[in-house]
Every structure is written in C-alpha cells, then in structure tokens.
C-alpha cells in the first residue's frame, strides 16, 4: 500500500467491482474468482491530458483493501499508538488524535476507539494495469466481466465508442475483444452500465445500447491467424476471406486451419543466370518461434523455377514483439534453363503441417510482381586508378540491382560496393600489387555478367606541395606533385577543427593541378579562419598544408565613372577585401588595357596612371582581374573646367 | 544485403472502423439512470430514466411501459399522484438521481431531484418474459419529515448513490449524497446514511444513522460519490474529494469508504485513500 513513483492520477472517473479470471488473478497475486475493484482514473476533474495517457486503470483487490483498513484501525486503536496519528475525517467530525474519539473528550470505559469513523493513515497504491496504453482515450464508463479464465474490461469512451479489452498487466499492447463506435453521434458513454444476461447496456446521449459481452462480432479481425487466435468465447471462425461467427457464414465457417499469407517478398527481381536469396514475408508460415521448417512441408516456386528452403540463420533471428506480427521465410532461387525473362508470380504452398496451438497451416498463397532479368554492363569509369586503391568506380548498365548478391571483382579481389541502383553500381577499388592492367568483372547472383573490361593500376599520386597558403571560396590553388593524374580526381578539403568542406579538383596535368577552394563561409568579413588544407587522390596518401588561411572573398564595387581632377595622375577606388587576398591570388589592374603598378591602402587601391596612357573623349576602361576573373569597374575620365569630360 | 521483412504492426490485423450495429432504444431524452432486472422465471427488464419519465423495456429493448415522473405539480405526473392530493413542494422537472432495485420485494425504487428528493417504490409484475411496474408507492410520510430531520429526503440534486442491502426481512438503503450549503438547508439530506425501508412502504424509518459534512465546511468541501457497491460483509462508496479540509479545495484525491453491511450503524465507517499512478 505504500506510495510508489510515477505520475499520479488522483481523480476517479468510473469504477466497477467484479470477480477476476485465473490469468489476472495470478498477476495480482490473488485467488481466481476474488473480487477486485477496478477504477478508471484521470489527472484532474476536467480529465485533460498531462504527460502520459488520458485515462489509467488500477485494480484494488477487495480483500487487500479490507486488510489495509483493518491494519489502519489497529494502528489507531491498539497500543502503542503512534503519537500524532490523527483520526481524520475532519469534515464529518471534530478533529482528534488516535485512539481518542472525535472531539476533545477522552475514551470512557464503556466506549471503544473502534466505534468511531476513521480515515486510515496509509493509502493503497497501484499502477496502471494498461501501462499507459489507453493513450488519448478518455474512458467514461466501465464494467468488468469474467469470461472463461479471462477478465474483460468493457469501457465506454468520451467519443461514443466501446472498448472491450482483456485485463492483463504483463503485455506492452492492448488485447482487444472489440473497439467499435456505438453510433454516429459520438456522444460520451455515460457512467452507469448494467448487465442483462449475456449483454451489457450502455447509455450514450438519449440512446441505450445492448452490447454482447463476448463482443459484437468478429469482422474486425482481418487475418485468419488473428481470427482463429481470438478468445474462444467470441466464437470466431474463418469464412474464406473474412472472420465471422458461425451464423454469419454457416457454409464456409471453420476454426481448423489457415492458409499461409504472403504479404511481401524481397527482392522483386532476380537474374536469369545466377541465384537469388528470396525472402518471403507474411503470416502463417510455420508458427514456430525458432523458424524451423518441418521437412517437405513448404514449397516455393517463382514462375517455373523452384526455390529451395533455407534454414533460418540463427544469428539473424530477432525477437519479435507479439505486438508486431510478421514471419520470414528464406529460400534460394536458381532459375531453370527454361525460365523466361519477364514478370512472374511467387507461390508458397504449405501442406502436412502439424497442428499449432490455435490452428494448423494449410493452403497456398500467390503474390505477383517478381521479374527475371538479365543484367547488362555497358560502361565502366574510370578504367584506371592508383595502386593504393580507393578509386570510386562507376559501373553503368541495366538491371544491375537485381537479385540479392553482386560483386565487382578487380583482378579477382572484391571492389567494395558503396551504392547500388538499377542502372549504376559504385564501388571502391582494392589496392593493387603492381602497376599493371588487370581484369575487371561483374558477378550478379554468382554468375558473370557478359563483357570484358580491364582496369589499369597506376603509380600512386604523390602531392608534394599546395600553394598559396591562403585563399577564399573558389579561388585557385595549385597542387604540385607526381602522378597526379593517376587518380580520377584529387580532393581538396579544408578542416577548421570543427567541420570539413571538400571540393574536387579537375584532372589536369600529371605534376600540376589547378584546383578551386571549396565552399566555406568566413563569418567575420574582417577576419579569416585558419585550418588544414589537404589534398588526396583516391586511396593514396594525402598531403596536408597546416595553417591555411581561409579569407572572405573580395567584393568588387559597382561600376561607375571614375572622374580625375586635372592635377591627379593616379586613380583611387575602393575594393573591399582585395588587399587582404593580395598574397593569395594574382591581381592585375589595367587602365585602357595598360597595366598599372597598383598599391593597397586598406580597402583602397591606388593605381598610378601609365605615362603612355591616352584618355580619350569617352575615357578608358578600368579593369581589375582577380585570380583570373576580370571586372570592368568603370571608365576613367578627366572632366573639363566646366565639368564636362575632356580628353588629355 | 541483409533485408528484413518490415514489421507489420499488430494493429494491422484488425480494423476498428468496422461498423457494428447493436440493438438500441431511443429514450427521447438524455438518459439519467438505468438499471436491469432478471427474475427467477426468465422474466427480465431494463429500466431507463430520463427527465420526467421512466421507461420499462423488455429484454429485446422494446418499450413495455412508460411512466411520467414529473414535472412535479403537473397533473400528468403519475408518480407525484401516489403521494396524494395537494402541493408537496415547489413545482419543477424531475431529474432521476437514484434508480435501484430492491431485490427482496422485488421492486424498483426511483428518487428524483423534485419533491425534496423523495423516492417511489414500484413493485415488479412479471408478464411472460417482460416485466411491468405496479402503481407507484410514495415513500414519504409527511408527519415524519421536517426540514431539519427528514428520513424520506433521500436524493440530492447534486447526486446520490444508493446500494440496497437485505438484512433479515428488512431492506436497508445505504445512501451517499453530494451536498452544498443550499442543498443542506432544504430538508437536510445527509452525506452518508443508512435508512431502513418501512414494511408498509410509507417511507423510511426515522432515527436513521448518518454522517454529514459539517456546516462550516459545506461551502468549500464537496464530495462527489462516484460509485457504490456491496460485496461480502461491507458496502463501499467511492468518492472524489479535496485531499484536505484546510488546503486547496481543487487538489483532489479518491477515497474508498467502507460501511458494515450487517450492522446498520456508522461507528465502523472507514475511509482509505486510493492512489493510482502511471509509471512509464
């Protein structure tokens, strides 16, 4: 009875007492048939949601309640009485301490402490039987019955539904007898429920509904397995394609067997030559948790071809929570020589199965949608790479993803697959022993795909230097080294200590590559970020330049006229961030096509005019080339005395 | 490529949107109370109370009989007429607050919000598999009832729970009513009481035992009686009430009250706090 942890649900909404069935009695550690008080509790008067479910159900065995009350009386009335223990019920009677009667007077010899009302000092604590699984449901009515050895809670809800649920504490899901709507009004089901024979009467709005205790029917069970696993008292049987009671389909009703049911299979295609490991999904395959299949009971065919059952790999067996139901069956498909390319059916037939706990499995299930295909390899790129391996090969073709296994072999060694799609395979080459041309092949389902390809192992690229040691987004970086073109791409990466950004260098010269810096945002427009700039080619060892400075990109000003005063022989213009990158990239300033020996003063650029320069009537274009990218910033003009431009 | 079957949720094996049509009865108004009766000779009935009316249904939910229980003061009120001529209190609608079976007789007892919360006794008359109600008896003796002491004032307009217990040849009504100051001032219903039905069905015996919320707490301390039942040697009431008379009245908890079903007295009235929790 001591309070426990957890979220309190202090407000009782509805209650009912009933004798319990064997299973729940065991869980409550009481005898079967003992009376238990069941209550639906909420967090507050409005019943609104807090964290956790809207309604919870607690079970209080009556004998335990009585024992707790009697113990409370003993604590109050038998000496030694704990000092300060109150009799309670101060709203009904005068306050007093045990063992005194209400009021101030002490016990007289002919009155007993036990002859006065008492609030027992300890409470009786219980946790939600449903473990929070009622979730958003707001229960408004409750009636508990015992059916066979099962205890069933019949609950009405705020939205006018009836939930008939087995009362068990040990599961992580609700075992429904039914869950249905009483009508279209959606009005709350009222608190008082009555029983009449094998029916319960619920009221909702202005209506009274008569609900069978064993549930309204079986049609809500969608699968044969679920149907025949229903409680015996529900009287459910399988009628070919639906679950029903015998009166609903007397001709086809049976409780004896279920056919297997294929719901899905994988893969949906396989090679015409070579094997495929086919996984069938569904229910009622073998009803054995270990996945053992009795000999000769399961026959799988795909088109004309048989699929040989495989023993379940025990390492792959995963515990299936009963709330999820799915069975897996694996078989090895080896197409017959007569098998044609194209779509076909997957068929599972189960016969001669021993009966299970609820039913035996017997029958056939067919599912469309498997296709036999012929993989074709059309192109491989690149056909060379460093001896170190790590080259990302792209194999292009058709039906490359069919089946369950494929391998790209480079000189007999597997090329590790990184991506598989119908038209493309990507894999990383293994290291090669020497510089040589070696065979490259593709196997699907263990069979070789036609075509003859060779891969050339080349000397490993060696990066010797990276320059300059600074730059900005997309600015050029020169990588020098040897055999740089042995790799399909060099990768340039900048790491600031927290994150890395990459760009791919275009394959150019064997000893020199011009790359562009990757996308990297320098937050502070006045600052820069130091980090490591690395270059690597496929799986070969890379080169790292520490202390690389990543700068914000310079921003050219908007183009306009640059008027010169008569006495001026140099032009000044602002170019934000240009001075900062002067050490990192080539900068060329020309006026009228002639170069000027520019200088930087902060963000100002000073360009002395070449003596040979002739400024015509329209002036001369001022062009700045930064890292090979040129912008015309405006035209240099010399205004006349009246402000009109004039030539010099 | 270790592909595994996608887990089919357990819920996919059933469809709770399937429509089921179950027998029903339209009462013509919001159902206020309902009780069922099953006799020894295969006769059964469902009694359904709505405002100002009591329906008697057969086991097939077809209407067998209908009785006007209000409005009080209305000439068509069939139960009111059982109390004789003359005004018996302020006129008004009758909301049924109590609808119980007295298994000893057997009889149906209904008590409403009108006429000081008095009750009416309807003897059950089997007719084949159905049941009819005999003419109602008014469980109210005017000369026994005063505003400060009214054994026949049973039902509170705020809600009343009743459990009937047979002790020897007598029927005892274990009554629990929600009170406030206004209700308490009119014909003094009690919070918890045990009342013996008089043998002549003229009302309840005076001098009954009772507990009531003390006048000083009536304004702030309200008790809602959610459920009552009888099992073994006890009658139990379940309440929702403030956790303390002194603290915040909106801080509620649930209690179980236990009364002896064998001794019609309240000395061994006990309460126990029921604590229900969700432990994720």
């Amino acid at each position: 009875g001591a309070p426990e942890g957890g979220q309190p649900y202090p407000v009782l909404r509805v209650a009912h007492s009933a004798p319990v069935g064997a299973q729940l009695a065991t869980e409550l550690s009481i005898a079967e048939g003992q009376e238990v008080l069941f209550g639906v509790f909420v967090t507050g008067k409005d019943g609104g949601p807090g964290v956790g479910p809207n309604s919870v159900v607690c079970a209080f065995p009556i004998d335990l309640l009585d024992t707790l009350i009697d113990e409370g009386v003993e604590r109050c009335c038998e000496s030694p009485v704990h000092p300060g223990l109150r009799r309670g019920l101060d709203f009904f009677q005068s306050p007093s301490f045990c063992p005194n009667p209400p009021g101030l007077e002490a016990l007289s010899p002919n009155t007993s402490c036990r002859h006065f009302p008492l609030l027992v000092s300890s409470s009786f604590s219980r946790v939600d039987l449903f473990n929070g699984l009622l979730g958003p449901v707001q229960v408004t009515a409750l009636y508990v019955t015992r059916l066979d050895n099962v205890t069933v809670a019949h609950m009405g809800t705020m939205d006018g539904r009836i939930l008939q649920v087995e009362l068990v504490r040990s599961l992580n899901y609700l075992l429904y007898v039914s869950n249905f709507s009483l009508g279209d009004s959606g009005q709350p089901v009222q608190r008082d429920v009555s029983r009449l024979g094998d029916h319960l009467l619920f009221a909702s709005g202005d209506q009274v509904f008569q609900v069978p205790i064993q549930g309204p029917g079986c049609r809500h069970f969608l699968t044969c397995g679920r149907c025949l696993r229903a409680w015996h008292f529900m009287g459910c049987g399988w009628c070919g394609n639906m679950c029903g009671q015998q009166k609903e389909c007397p001709g086809s009703w049976q409780q004896d067997h279920c056919p297997p049911k294929l719901t899905e299979f994988h893969p949906h295609s396989g090679p015409l030559r070579g094997s495929t490991r086919l996984t069938l999904c569904g229910s009622n395959f073998y009803l054995h948790p270990s996945g053992l299949v009795p000999e000769g009971t399961h026959q799988v065919t795909v088109g004309q071809s048989p699929c040989r059952p495989l023993p379940k790999d025990s390492s792959k067996l995963r515990p299936v929570p009963r709330k999820d139901f799915v069975e897996e069956f694996e078989c090895e498909l080896e197409p017959l020589g007569t098998q044609a390319v194209g779509p076909t059916n997957v068929s599972l037939t189960v016969t001669n199965m021993p009966p299970g706990k609820h039913f035996r499995v017997d029958g056939t299930s067919v599912l469309r949608g498997f296709s036999f295909m012929e993989p074709v390899l059309i192109a491989v790129q690149p056909l060379f790479g460093p001896r170190a391996g790590g080259t990302c090969l792209t194999l292009e073709g058709q039906s490359l993803s069919v089946g369950t296994s494929r391998a790209v072999l480079v000189n007999g060694t597997e090329c590790l697959l990184a991506r598989v799609s119908e038209g493309q395979l990507l894999c990383a080459t293994p290291p090669g022993a020497t510089v040589a041309s070696v065979p490259l092949s593709l196997q699907v389902g263990g069979a070789q795909v036609p075509g003859s390809w060779t891969f050339q192992y080349r000397e490993d690229p060696v990066v010797l230097s990276i320059s300059p040691n600074c730059g900005y987004i997309n600015s050029h970086i020169t990588i020098c080294g040897q055999h740089l073109t042995s790799a399909w791409h060099l990768v340039l990466s900048f790491h600031d200590g927290l994150r890395a950004v990459e760009s791919r260098c275009e394959r150019q010269l064997p000893e020199q590559q011009l790359c562009r810096l990757p996308e990297y945002v320098v937050r502070d427009p006045q600052g820069w970020v130091a980090g490591n700039l690395s270059a690597r080619g496929d799986g070969a060892a890379g080169f790292t330049l520490p202390g690389f400075r990543f700068l914000p990109p310079p921003h050219p000003p908007s183009a306009n006229l640059v008027p010169l005063k008569p006495e001026e022989h140099a032009i000044k213009f602002e170019y934000i961030g240009l001075g900062a990158v002067a050490d990192c990239v080539g900068i060329n300033v020309t006026v009228g096509g002639e170069s000027c020996q520019h200088e930087f003063r902060g963000d100002m650029v000073v360009c002395p005019l070449p003596p040979s320069l002739q400024l015509g009537q329209d002036g001369a274009p001022l062009q700045v080339c930064v890292d090979g990218e040129c912008h015309i910033l405006g035209r240099v003009v010399r205004p006349g005395p009246d402000g009109v431009p004039q030539s010099t | 490529e270790d592909w595994q079957c996608p887990r089919t949720p357990y819920a996919a094996s059933r469809d709770f949107d399937v429509k089921y049509v179950v027998p029903s009865f339209s009462a013509g108004g919001l159902v206020q109370a309902m009780v069922t009766y099953e006799g020894d000779r295969n006769e059964s009935a469902v009694f359904v109370a709505i405002r100002n009316r009591l329906h008697v249904l057969g086991p097939d939910l077809k209407s067998v009989q209908s009785l006007a229980t209000g409005p009080a003061g209305d000439p068509g009120c069939q139960t009111c007429a059982a109390c004789g001529p003359g005004p018996h209190g302020p006129p008004g609608d009758t909301d049924t607050k109590v609808l119980v079976l007295d298994p000893a007789l057997p009889a149906l007892v209904s008590c409403g919000s009108s006429l000081q919360g008095r009750c009416f006794l309807h003897d059950l008359e089997p007719q084949g598999t159905a049941v009819h109600l005999a003419a109602p008896a008014c469980l109210f003796s005017a000369h026994h009832n005063r505003p400060d002491d009214c054994p026949d004032c049973v039902a509170s307009p705020l809600g009343t729970r009743v459990t009937v217990v047979e002790q020897g040849q007598a029927s005892y009504f274990y009554v629990a009513s929600s009170l406030d100051a206004a209700v308490a001032a009119s014909f003094s219903p009690r919070s918890v009481s045990i009342r013996r039905l008089k043998a002549d069905a003229s009302g309840f015996a005076p001098g009954f035992v009772a507990l009531s919320v003390l006048p000083k707490h009536l304004v702030s301390y309200s008790i809602e009686y959610v459920h009552s039942f009888h099992t073994g040697a006890f009658v139990y009431f379940l309440t929702v009430q403030p956790a303390s008379v002194t603290d915040d009245p909106s801080a509620l908890h649930t209690r179980l009250a236990r009364l002896s079903a064998t001794e019609p007295e309240l000395g061994d009235y006990r309460e126990l706090v029921l604590d229900c929790r969700f432990a994720p």
Epitope: Q482, T485, E506, R507, Q508, L509, P510, Q512 | -
Partner: antibody
Framework: QVKLQQSGPGLVAPSQSLSITCTVS????????VHWVRQPPGKGLEWLGV???????NYNSALMSRLSISKDNSKSQVFLKMNSLQTDDTAMYYC???????????WGAGTTVTVSS | DIVLTQTTAIMSASPGEKVTMTCSAS?????IHWYQQKSSTSPKLWIY???KLASGVPGRFSGSGSGNSYSLTISSMEAEDVATYYC?????????FGAGTKLELK
C-alpha cells in the same frame, strides 16, 4: 576512333578577332581535355591553353588577356576565341586531345590563320 | 616557366648512321615526350613518358634521360625519319615545347 576536325577562317584583319571550332568524335568532352597549340610559319610549337573535362580553363599567361576557350559538350565542340589579332598571330592553329599522362595523343589537321589587311 | 632547349636546330645524318638529339630542361621534369612533324602535317606523338614508343613507331627509335637532360636516339637513320622533332613537357603549367631539331638526310 578518336578524331578532331577543325574549322575556321583563313584570313583575319588586324585588331579583329579569331574564332575556330574543333569538333571531336570517338570520345566525350566530359572525360577528356582539349588543348590548343599554334605554329607560326617556319617556327616551333607554342601551347595556347586548355579546356578540361569539367570546364576548367588554363591559358598561356602571355596570351591570357586575349584568349578564351569554351565548349559545348552536347555538340562535342570546343571553341577558341582570340581578340585583337596582329600580324605575328599568323600561324597554323591546332587542337589536340590530352591523355592525362602529360602528352597530346591525337591532333587536329590544323587551321591556317593569316592576319593581314 | 620550364624552358626546353634543343641546342641543335638542324642536324643531318646519312642512312644507317646513329643519330642522337638532346633536350635540356631549365628545371627538373619527370618525363619528356617527343613529337615528329613532317612538313605540312600535324605533329605526331613519337615517344612518350621519356622512353615509351608510340603506336606505329619503328623500333630503331629510343628515348632516355631524367631530371634536366633527355635525348632521342635513332640507331640507324633512314630516309623516312627526315622530319622535325620537338621535345615537350606536359606535366606543369605552362605546357612548353622545345624549339625543335630538324633532321635532314646527308
């Protein structure tokens, strides 16, 4: 079989611009780079620039301001554009495919360009 | 820029004579490639990666060298070998050619 075919004007007036097209077959411009080389009459070979498979260009710095190389992968065509031609730009202009091992393996037949008024 | 110098602009040799022409680089290069150009035709790749003969090149030709010094050798001159031979480096920007050595028949 790899082939490079060139087309362009024979005669260009001084200060005018030159445009030559090199159409390739037998390989894809998305896989290989194409270079331009010229040879003045009776003289040696001079590398002008390149457009790589991904579209990156590199130029001989002496000619950078006047030179532009572009391409249309879908048409398998590479374009050379040179501005402000002078008489010393008179030469045979070749396009050549590059093997990535550091050499040109296949050359176009060349386009004769004469700069004269 | 890497400057390739072919010191002998013109050389002549009699049929059957051994011919060696040189190419020196202003800074070290890993490989040198040789092109043969006959009058009014496009250059042809003749020797690549310093010593490997291009497809269709007679076996009397050979190439050697490393670092700054490279050479092309014809073990036995033949009339069809009359052409201009250019050395070339294509490993670093800007790509550069030697001025060429014109080989004539004596």
């Amino acid at each position: 079989q790899v082939k490079l075919q060139q087309s362009g004007p024979g005669l260009v007036a001084p200060s005018q611009s030159l445009s030559i097209t090199c159409t390739v077959s037998g390989f894809s411009l998305t896989s290989y780079g194409v270079h331009w080389v010229r040879q003045p009459p009776g003289k040696g070979l001079e590398w002008l620039g390149v457009i790589w498979a991904g579209g990156t260009t590199n130029y001989n710095s002496a000619l950078m301001s006047r030179l532009s190389i572009s391409k249309d992968n879908s048409k398998s065509q590479v374009f050379l554009k040179m501005n402000s031609l002078q008489t010393d730009d008179t030469a045979m202009y070749y396009c050549a495919s590059y093997d990535y091992d550091g050499y040109f393996d296949v050359w176009g037949a060349g386009t004769t360009v004469t700069v004269s008024s | 820029d890497i400057v390739l110098t072919q010191t002998t602009a013109i050389m002549s040799a009699s049929p059957g004579e051994k011919v060696t022409m040189t190419c020196s680089a202003s800074s070290s290069v890993s490989y040198i490639h040789w092109y043969q150009q006959k009058s009014s035709t496009s250059p042809k790749l003749w020797i690549y990666d310093t010593s490997k003969l291009a497809s269709g090149v007679p076996g009397r030709f050979s190439g050697s060298g490393s670092g700054n010094s490279y050479s092309l050798t014809i073990s036995s001159m033949e009339a069809e070998d009359v052409a201009t031979y250019y050395c070339f480096q294509g490993n670093k920007y800007p790509l550069t050619f030697g001025a060429g050595t014109k080989l004539e028949l004596k």
